[in-house]
Interface confidence: low
């Protein structure tokens, strides 16, 4: 059962796993949610009736029955983890805590103009978990405007105390706001020889990399595969760090793989969701339950639905036994990973999918697309929407992309002449325009947010957000596309598609069926040569064939240029402008979305 509200003046008795310090009960709930075993918590707020050493303590708790006895206690705030909830979860915490000093290892001290600048510094520093900033009213003159960057083993403060004229806050890495590089490569036959901060068991290097990503101190990792010569180290995932933030030594070793934390890419690739099955592999751990199941998929479902289950092993049925049902062993451990991994016993193992909701919805795999042809099939581009205007008569105006359950990203130039959001309708899950009838459901638009530097498409900033009046329920035919990570600026996308209902030649009409075209990206230097009369800025991205023939056109504006990278689709561009359509040596010009990620997050995450 999902319980989101906090219980004031209430303490849960017993079940303690560990105690951490958090600046608020709300953040204590987030920490509990991300902890592998925590189901409930009790937070102690500051209060004259409480011992100040207990202020801001966040006690993480577990219970076999998923609940604990409640006791009345002033200043205690209790609640449940969001593990039991189906909604999307984020660790992003933009709150600034006034007059609180969050203690940790102060490893960097510098002058900053504001708390915001200090927070940005923390976000862009690989080691920083949180910061404390002494304001210009701070009593000690030499400490005024000092920005202290801090880290701890757990990523949370070691203590929190009241201190006048300081403010504290957390790194915004988990809000996708870091400019740190996103290095996705996994290096085969490589060992990083730096200090280990922790080790866990993992079935492959990908899971090891994802574990590293959500471990607060891990910056890179080394994984020993099941063919590693030393038996005791097989399937061992070593979580590592270094002072510089990079591996100091790389050693060539066969059957080992190494890679980096995906902290700076986490909004565009799954980091919590281990969805694969591991055949002929047994995961060992504390047994939670043994149930009969028809298949390993059914076993994974059972694990996902059991809130305490972290991983499972399924042993297929022996011929004609138990109505063809095998045994499903639901398991858990102190850190969420198997305590040992064994091969050759015939089991099929995997992880709970409960943690998938901690990843961005946009990373969910969509069904395979039809290659070739120009007409799309249903569900092929589930983020694509058709934006209609109802004035003077109803018609398709522009495309757009679902990027959140209340947000559509589109082009600013679509709104010339649109004097009110009331005349706009957003249709999602549409393949053919002819499906849209009087009674077809649509999303009304609450607000049009146009970039304030927008003047005309050709000079850039051609980007706008639509805030919907109601939220989109994600299904196979309507779901979000990932924004590119800022750390991905140097990625070379090779699988890019433009979609829309637009014209197929300049003097044409809106198409009934959603069209698609695979189009290669063109460098900005090359694009600039083709548009000498314009300034092609880094905030634009171009795509097209030298010989022309495939391009976006009228009616495609605002729609996506979608590129697939590492099995995840990213919204790389927004259809903006071009010289004619599909002309030789005239690529289409798109808004370069990665350059606007900060703007998008600022507008969509505003309270």
């Amino acid at each position: 059962e999902c319980v989101t509200q906090l219980l004031k003046d209430t303490c849960f008795e017993g079940g303690d796993i560990t105690t951490v310090f958090t600046p608020s009960a709300k953040y204590c709930q987030v920490v509990c949610t991300y902890h592998p075993r925590c189901l409930l918590f009790t937070f102690t707020a500051e209060s004259p009736s409480e011992d100040p050493t207990r202020w801001f303590t966040c006690v993480l708790k577990d219970s076999v029955t998923e609940t604990l006895p409640r006791v009345n206690r002033t200043a205690a705030i209790s609640g449940y983890s969001f593990k039991q909830c189906s909604h999307q979860i984020s660790a992003c915490n933009k709150d600034i805590y006034v007059d609180l000093d969050m203690k940790g290892i102060n490893y960097n001290s510098s002058v900053a103009k504001s708390a915001q600048e200090c927070q940005e510094r923390c976000t862009d520093d690989v080691h920083c978990h949180f910061f404390t900033y002494a304001t210009r009213q701070f009593p000690s003159l030499e400490h005024r405007n000092i920005c202290l960057l801090k880290h701890t083993q757990t990523g949370t403060p070691t203590r929190i105390t009241k201190l006048d004229k300081v403010v504290s806050g957390f790194s915004l890495k988990s809000c996708a706001l870091s400019n740190l590089a996103c290095i996705r490569d996994i290096f085969p036959n490589t060992v990083f020889a730096d200090s280990n901060i922790d080790s866990v068991m993992a079935p492959d290097a990908f899971v090891c990399g994802r574990i590293c990503t959500h471990h607060p101190g891990c910056l890179f990792f080394t994984f020993f595969s099941q063919e590693w010569p030393k038996e005791s180290q097989r399937n061992l995932c070593l979580l590592k760090t270094s002072e510089s933030g990079l591996p100091s030594t790389r050693i060539k070793k066969s059957k080992a793989l190494s890679g980096f934390s995906l902290q700076s890419c986490r909004h565009s690739i799954p980091v919590f969701c281990h969805s694969s099955f591991y055949h002929d592999t047994d995961f060992l751990g504390e047994e939670l339950d043994i149930v009969a199941a028809k298949s390993h998929e059914a076993c994974q479902k059972l694990c996902t639905n059991a809130v305490r289950c972290q991983f499972f092993t399924y042993t297929p049925a022996q011929a004609s036994c138990n109505e063809g049902k095998g045994k499903c062993y639901l398991k858990l451990s102190s850190n969420g990973s198997p305590t040992k991994i064994l091969h050759g016993r015939g089991g099929i193992s995997g992880y709970t999918l409960r943690l998938c909701k901690m990843d961005n919805e946009c990373t969910t795999k969509i069904k395979p697309r039809i290659v070739g042809g120009t007409a799309s099939v249903r569900g092929e581009w589930p983020w694509q929407v058709t934006l209609h205007t109802t004035s003077p008569t109803q018609r398709h105006l522009c495309g757009g992309s679902i990027i959140g359950n209340q947000w559509i990203l589109t082009a600013a130039h679509c709104f010339y002449g649109v004097e009110s959001p009331k005349i706009l309708r957003v249709y999602s899950g549409i393949l053919n325009q002819s499906e849209i009838k009087e009674d077809t459901s649509f999303f009304g638009v609450q607000e049009i947010i146009i970039h304030d530097q927008y003047k005309m498409a050709e000079s850039g900033y051609d980007i706008a957000l639509l805030k919907l009046e109601t939220t989109v329920n994600y299904t196979d035919s309507q779901r979000p596309i990932c924004l590119p990570s800022k750390g991905d600026r140097n990625v070379i996308y090779t699988d890019c598609w433009v979609t829309g209902w637009g014209y197929r030649k300049l003097r044409d009409k809106i198409q009934n069926t959603l069209q698609k075209a695979k189009i290669p990206l063109v460098t900005n230097e090359e694009c600039q040569k083709r548009y000498r009369g314009h300034k092609i800025t880094h905030k634009m991205i171009c795509a097209g064939y030298r010989e022309g023939g495939k391009d976006a056109c009228k009616g495609d504006s605002g729609g996506p240029l979608s590129c697939k990278h590492n099995e995840v689709w990213h919204l790389v561009g927004i259809t903006s402008w071009g010289e004619g359509c599909a002309q030789r040596e005239r690529p289409g010009v798109y808004t370069n979305v990665v350059e606007y990620v900060d703007w998008i997050l600022e507008k969509t995450q505003a309270v």
């Epitope: 105006l397 010339y416 002449g417 498409a457 000079s459 009228k554 495609d556 402008w577």
Partner: nanobody, 121 residues
């Protein structure tokens, strides 16, 4: 129904001048970016010049910079193109249209018929 009507084309000698007009109706003219597009015989469409609805900022193709001037009179719902120092390569049918963006204010029947400009000695 949106209507665009170009006028002012004709035959002119190299070095001569012409002023094209485009009268727009059926739309809130002041809210739209407008542009002039031309199509030379046997060639594709080429954007010549554009003007922004908000601040009146303009852009020109390199081939016409310094010779052509775009302007608009929102009170009269009219777009203009002053063409000076005309060259033979300026010969084309000139259309008035929205900017080179890819929205759909103008359905397929919203284009003007164009006006022929011929530069020849």
């Amino acid at each position: 129904q949106v209507q665009l009507q170009e006028s002012g084309g004709g035959l002119v000698q190299p070095g001569g001048s012409l002023r094209l007009s485009c009268a727009a109706s059926g739309l809130t003219f002041s809210l739209y970016d407008m542009s002039w597009v031309r199509q030379a015989p046997g060639k594709g469409l080429e954007g010549v010049s554009g003007i922004n609805s908000g601040d009146g900022s303009t852009y020109y193709a390199d081939s016409v910079k310094g010779r052509f001037t775009i302007s608009r009179d929102n009170a009269k719902n009219t777009l203009y193109l002053q063409m000076n120092s005309l060259k033979t390569e300026d010969t084309a049918v000139y259309y008035c249209a929205t900017g080179r963006t890819r929205e759909t204010y103008f359905r397929e029947d919203d284009w003007g018929q164009g006006t022929q400009v011929t530069v020849s000695s």
